[in-house]
């Protein structure tokens, strides 16, 4: 089945641009002026997921790349990693489960829970140039919270 | 608050086009999407398609290939063009927002502008 | 392509009634349906997401229930104000967001 998706680049609360940091890493820093054409382009689409309240399961793709963000356990630890698909059979309706975040939207700002993992989500450090990871605390040191902005084409 | 201002709305003749402007404000159109709903005289609501980005948008499968939905960000304006318009186009076009990205559900409207397609 | 059906299409009702319109989906939708409420000359206004849950400003007399292919709006105690046409939508079918026929409430 065809899946609704867009274009967009995330910020996180502090305002601090995702770019990428090697094949497969993503960092979070602030930038401005021309570096913001650093920041990294999401493909983000609307997907199968479990029922629920009002979460919204969404896959994350890097736009024109055959990689997607993907939660697995690495030594017994939830992790982060981008991972390489093959393009002819993605984006998808029903993506695995790995690939599913749960989108929650409060007063403009995102969250992203993995379905693979609950109460997991989408994380970036205070400090600057850190790795984006995938953080098992809310409202802690480290951020879960985004801003969404689409991308003219 | 937030406000959603349809135009452009008026009398044209079958074959013909007409381009409708929806204004909004008390939110962006760069974090938002945007959908067209159109309502035929005593008829139900009938989606017409949604924008995301400019280079995403969906349409309702009839509306393919004659509606095209775009927007200028910087105006906070969103665009229906419409072309090869019939009879049965005559009808009250809303602009509307949904409510959460993906959510499908639409919590803002417009008061909704009338094009009447007659010769 | 999902088809939304709606009963009835038209219900004559008395403030204090409580009333019942039901939604069917021609395949499973899991819980991604809206109800909205419409005057005469008015847009349309959110009313119900995701199947159950009330959307802001929305008085409590309105609820909704139900999840695959069969859902219900219901006002338990009807008001002057609700007499109106409801339409509920389909959110989450892939490409098409697609809207019911429509159920008039009348005196």
């Known amino acids: 089945a065809p899946v609704r998706s867009l274009n967009c680049t995330l910020r996180d609360s502090q305002q601090k641009s995702l770019v990428m940091s090697g094949p497969y890493e993503l960092k979070a820093l602030h930038l401005q002026g021309q570096d913001m054409e650093q920041q990294v382009v999401f493909s983000m689409s609307f997907v199968q997921g479990e029922e629920s309240n009002d979460k919204i399961p969404v896959a994350l793709g890097l736009k024109e790349k055959n990689l997607y963000l993907s939660c697995v356990l690495k030594d017994d630890k939830p992790t982060l990693q981008l991972e390489s698909v093959d393009p002819k059979n993605y984006p998808k309706k029903k993506m695995e489960k790995r690939f599913v975040f749960n989108k929650i939207e409060i007063n403009n700002k995102l969250e992203f829970e993995s379905a693979q993992f609950p109460n997991w989500y989408i994380s970036t450090s205070q400090a600057e140039n850190m790795p984006v990871f995938l953080g098992g605390t809310k409202g802690g040191q480290d951020i879960t919270d985004f801003t969404m902005q689409f991308v003219s084409s | 608050e937030v406000q959603l201002v349809e135009s452009g709305g008026g009398l044209v003749q079958p074959g013909g086009s007409l381009r409708l402007s929806c204004t909004v404000s008390?939110?962006?159109?760069?974090?938002?999407?945007m959908s067209w709903v159109r309502q035929a005289p005593g008829k139900g609501l009938e989606w017409i398609g949604i924008?995301?980005?400019?280079?995403?948008?969906y349409y309702a499968s009839w509306a393919k290939g004659r509606f095209t939905i775009s927007k200028d960000t910087s105006k906070n304006t969103l665009y229906l063009q419409m072309n090869s318009l019939r009879a049965e186009d005559t009808a009250v076009y809303f602009c509307?927002?949904?409510?959460?990205?993906?959510?499908?559900?639409?919590?803002?409207w417009g008061q909704g502008t009338t094009v009447t397609v007659s010769s | 392509e999902i088809v939304m059906t709606q009963s009835p299409s038209t219900l004559s009702a008395s403030v204090g009634d409580r009333v019942i319109i039901t939604c069917r989906a021609s395949?499973?939708?899991?819980?991604?349906l809206s109800w909205y409420q419409q005057k005469p000359g008015k847009a349309p206004k959110l009313l119900i997401y995701?199947?159950?849950n009330l959307a802001s400003g929305v008085p409590s007399r309105f609820s909704g229930s139900g999840s695959g292919a069969e859902f219900t709006l219901t006002i338990s105690s009807l008001q002057p104000e609700d007499f109106a046409t409801y339409y509920c939508?389909?959110?989450?079918?892939?490409?098409?967001?697609?809207f019911g026929q429509g159920t008039k409430l009348t005196v």
């Open positions: 939508q389909n959110t989450g079918g892939g490409i098409n967001i697609a």
């Open positions: 395949q499973s939708i899991g819980n991604w």
């Open positions: 008390g939110f962006s159109l760069s974090s938002y999407a």
């Open positions: 924008i995301y980005d400019s280079a995403s948008t």
């Open positions: 509307a927002r949904e409510r959460q990205i993906f959510s499908g559900d639409m919590d803002g």
């Open positions: 995701r199947a159950s």
